[in-house]
């Protein structure tokens, strides 16, 4: 049988002679040279050579374990003369023994990491990992230890894991934002003679809200003209906050002061300024100075740093009111006056009244804006503001007239105010009611003496141009002279409509194909007005159900109220 022992060769051997790997030996080998040893398999004859008598195997080349860690070879023992196998062919392995010839290498040449400022000591920042190509199962060639070369005392690294942690409390982004750390990985467990590799880690402190906003001054001075209109900007304040992003966002509020009703503040998020605007008009003659207490506060507060607070600051804003020559002021924002229609020219409609608010108290002159009174219905007394009519007015033409009245200072025509004046024209019953439409009635021919139906021939209604008080209720009737008309009657429905009914049947087109029925309509005014309207009633051929078949005047009119 084969006699085996371990076959190995040290990698990277560079001696002058081939290195002995081991010896093939059979226990039937008597040493007479009758046995011939044959080597085959991976690297046989090139890397590994055998002395076929002694069975000694030598490595002829330098081997690299990191390239190939083992070789599988086949051993044979045969009779030197007959080549007859003396042992069964057998596989064996030659192992390449490791030496520490590879340094540790980091996965990345540089790393980038973030950690919030003011993080607690020991906060994990990032894990860096190195690898070593040497054999981890043999010796310490691949046993790595991490250490920090640059970056102390701010950061530390765990020797076994490569986890970088914060090492200093209260690191402040506002003082230093970026750190450059160098980490070393060394093999041989970190001992002398070990190989090493390094990597650079750039660590950025991210912002937290650890700074309150601060006004750079304790008082702001501003001024506003009394002529300024609400919404107009008065001035700006700005609190500085060294934090960035949403941690640095500031919002402004007025928290106190005698100007709280007259001024407001909004936040300009582009510039992070507080914009003070006029909320209500100010009057130099009434009050000449205002004071505001303005607060700047962070929008987003971090609960962890609440004890650093308060995250707000206040400042005093003093606003002085500047005098302006103001236009006259009407005593009312608008006026409503009434006048009866048909009133004689020169009738007084009403009065407007304005005053100069300035200390000078200049006299006022009034005028009508002629663009608003193109028909010149009205005049105004320039000195006292009384408005009068120039002609009778017709409510049915215009029920409301809207004019604009100007008031100007006598010494400065540019200082002018205007006011809308609405004039309601009151109704007088000066229109009689009329048919609401050009009604036409149709009645069926019949040889029956009774009316064919108790339905109205047509239902009529009326229109009156006057106001409702002088319009409905409308009363419909036949004129007194034909009240007992044998053919038709009018029944007032008491809802501003009336039905026209046939009093008999037996209408014949040959006898008479058209009837003209006068109808009196009077309105509900005091005194009432009335008109006589003529209803045309045509006699038509109908079917037994009362539906039209034909009329002599075929161009009959369809009405919503039509019924036959």
């Amino acid at each position: 049988g084969w006699v085996w022992n371990q076959f190995f060769v040290i990698e990277e051997y560079t001696g002058p002679d081939p290195v002995l790997v081991g010896r093939l030996h059979s226990d039937i080998d008597s040493g007479d040279g009758n046995i011939k040893y044959i080597l085959s398999g991976e690297g046989a004859g090139t890397i590994f050579v055998i002395d076929d008598k002694s069975g000694n195997i030598h490595a002829t080349k330098t081997l690299d374990r990191e390239e190939r860690a083992q070789y599988t070879l086949m051993a044979q023992a045969v009779d030197r003369d007959t080549n007859r196998p003396l042992e069964p062919p057998s596989e064996f392995i030659v192992k390449v023994q490791d030496i520490n010839d590879n340094p540790p290498e980091f996965l990345h040449e540089t790393y980038h990491a973030n950690v919030p400022e003011r993080s607690n000591v020991g906060t994990s920042v990032i894990q860096v990992t190195a690898s070593d190509a040497d054999d981890p199962t043999y010796g310490n060639s691949a046993k790595l230890v991490y250490s920090i070369l640059e970056g102390q005392p701010y950061f530390s690294v765990e020797a076994q894991t490569g986890i970088i942690r914060t090492a200093l409390p209260n690191m402040d982004r506002e003082a230093k934002e970026e750190y450059h750390v160098v980490i070393q990985a060394k093999d041989m467990g970190g001992h002398m003679g070990g190989l090493s590799g390094t990597t650079k880690v750039t660590i950025t402190l991210t912002d937290v809200n650890d700074n309150p906003p601060k006004f750079p001054q304790s008082v702001y001075q501003m001024s506003v003209s009394e002529a300024a209109v609400p919404g107009e900007e008065v001035g700006r304040v700005k609190a500085k906050d060294p934090d960035i992003g949403e941690n640095g966002l500031v919002t402004y509020n007025i928290v106190d002061g005698d100007g709280m009703e007259s001024f407001e503040i909004t936040t300009d998020y582009e510039t992070q300024e507080g914009v003070i605007k006029l909320k209500k008009p100010v009057d130099f003659e009434t009050k000449r100075a205002y004071s505001l207490k303005v607060e700047a506060a962070n929008v987003h507060i971090d609960p962890k740093f609440i004890s650093n607070g308060p995250f707000k600051d206040t400042v005093t804003v003093k606003i002085s009111v500047e005098d302006a020559d103001e236009p006259p002021m009407f005593l009312a924002p608008s006026y409503i006056h009434e006048v009866q229609e048909n009133a004689a020219a020169g009738t007084v409609v009403g009065r407007v009244h304005a005053k100069d608010p300035d200390a000078a108290n200049s006299p006022i002159r009034y005028s009508i804006d002629r663009h608003t009174d193109l028909d010149r219905f009205f005049t105004i007394n320039p000195e006292d503001g009384f408005i009068k009519t120039t002609k009778p007015l017709d409510r049915e033409e215009t029920a409301w007239l809207n004019i604009t009245v100007f008031a100007a200072e006598i010494h400065n025509r540019h200082q002018e105010a205007k006011v809308p004046v609405a004039i309601r024209v009151l109704d007088v019953n000066d229109n009689a009611p009329k048919f609401a439409a050009p009604y036409e009635g149709f009645i069926c021919e019949s040889d029956q003496t009774k009316p064919l139906s108790n339905q109205p021939i047509v239902t009529i209604s009326a229109d009156d141009k006057d106001d409702t008080a002088n319009g409905p209720r409308f009363i419909f009737s036949l004129p007194p002279e034909i009240i007992h008309n044998p053919n038709f009657t009018v029944r007032d429905n008491r809802d501003n409509t009336a039905g026209v009914y046939a009093r008999r049947g037996g209408f014949s087109r040959q006898k008479q194909d058209l009837y003209l029925l006068p109808i009196v309509i009077s309105d509900g005014g005091i005194p009432p007005m009335s008109s006589t309207n003529t209803l045309t009633i045509k006699v038509c051929g109908c079917d037994v159900n009362g539906a039209l078949l034909s009329c002599n005047a075929e161009a009959y009119i369809l009405n919503a109220g039509l019924s036959t």
């Epitope: 079917d543 159900n545 009405n559 039509l562 019924s563």
Partner: antibody
């Protein structure tokens, strides 16, 4: 409840005549005109004509003049329609229907009588 | 005579869907004389809507009618299974009275 009860189905030969009846109940027969409507198999409705039960006056659709004759018997509150010279075109369901005079709509319909003309 | 045309002749609708059918007259018809009838297979027609927009007794409020002149319509705000039927439009403005060809309503 207003009802119009019509006579039963009729199977008649071409050229013959048929008289179908419509008995009214639940209302005053003479207050409403009676109308007749034809519905051919699966088709729409066609007005045949109408009769005033008070006077016996009638109106016919031009298409049915000479084909249909409408009569009433006030004593039994019954309306009749006679169809003559029957052809296969006259096979249909025939309805009597009451007319509401004011707006002229058919507010009550009979049960329908099926007439089949076949040799 | 006045010719009455209904469209569509057949229509399918899902339950809960809004349904509208139209009726067109060849000449102007007073709204007082435009009516609608419902007919189910094997039954007589029933008055459904009279004078354009008035619901006959017992007709559900989901039905409505509108129109004027030559154009009229019947609408069901939310289709229900019991609404499956044929609907006929009818004018009696002028004699002879005429009916539309019918609109058959089915469930989708």
């Amino acid at each position: 409840e207003f009802q119009l009860q019509q006579s039963g189905p009729e199977l008649v030969k071409p050229g013959a005549s048929v008289k179908i009846s419509c008995k009214a109940s639940g209302y005053s027969f003479t207050d409403y005109n009676m109308n007749w409507v034809k519905q051919s198999n699966g088709k729409s409705l066609e007005w045949i004509g109408a009769i005033n039960p008070n006077y016996g006056t009638t109106s016919y659709n031009q298409k049915f003049k000479g084909k249909a004759t409408l009569t009433v018997d006030q004593s039994s509150s019954t309306a009749y329609m006679q169809l003559n010279s029957l052809t296969s075109e006259d096979s249909a369901v025939y309805y009597c229907t009451r007319l509401y005079y004011g707006s002229r709509y058919f507010d009550v319909w009979g049960t329908g009588t099926t007439v089949t003309v076949s040799s | 005579q006045i010719v009455v045309t209904q469209s569509p002749a057949i229509m399918s609708a899902s339950l809960g869907e809004r349904v509208t059918m139209t009726c067109t007259a060849s000449s102007s018809v007073s709204s007082s004389y435009l009516h609608w009838y419902q007919q189910k297979p094997g039954s007589s027609p029933k008055l459904w809507i009279y004078s354009t927009s008035n619901l006959a007794s017992g007709v559900p409020a989901r039905f409505s009618g509108s129109g004027s002149g030559t154009s009229y319509s019947l609408t069901i705000s939310s289709m229900e299974a019991e609404d499956v039927a044929t609907y006929y439009c009818h004018q009696y403005h002028r004699s002879p009275p005429t009916f539309g060809g019918g609109a058959k309503l089915e469930i989708k």
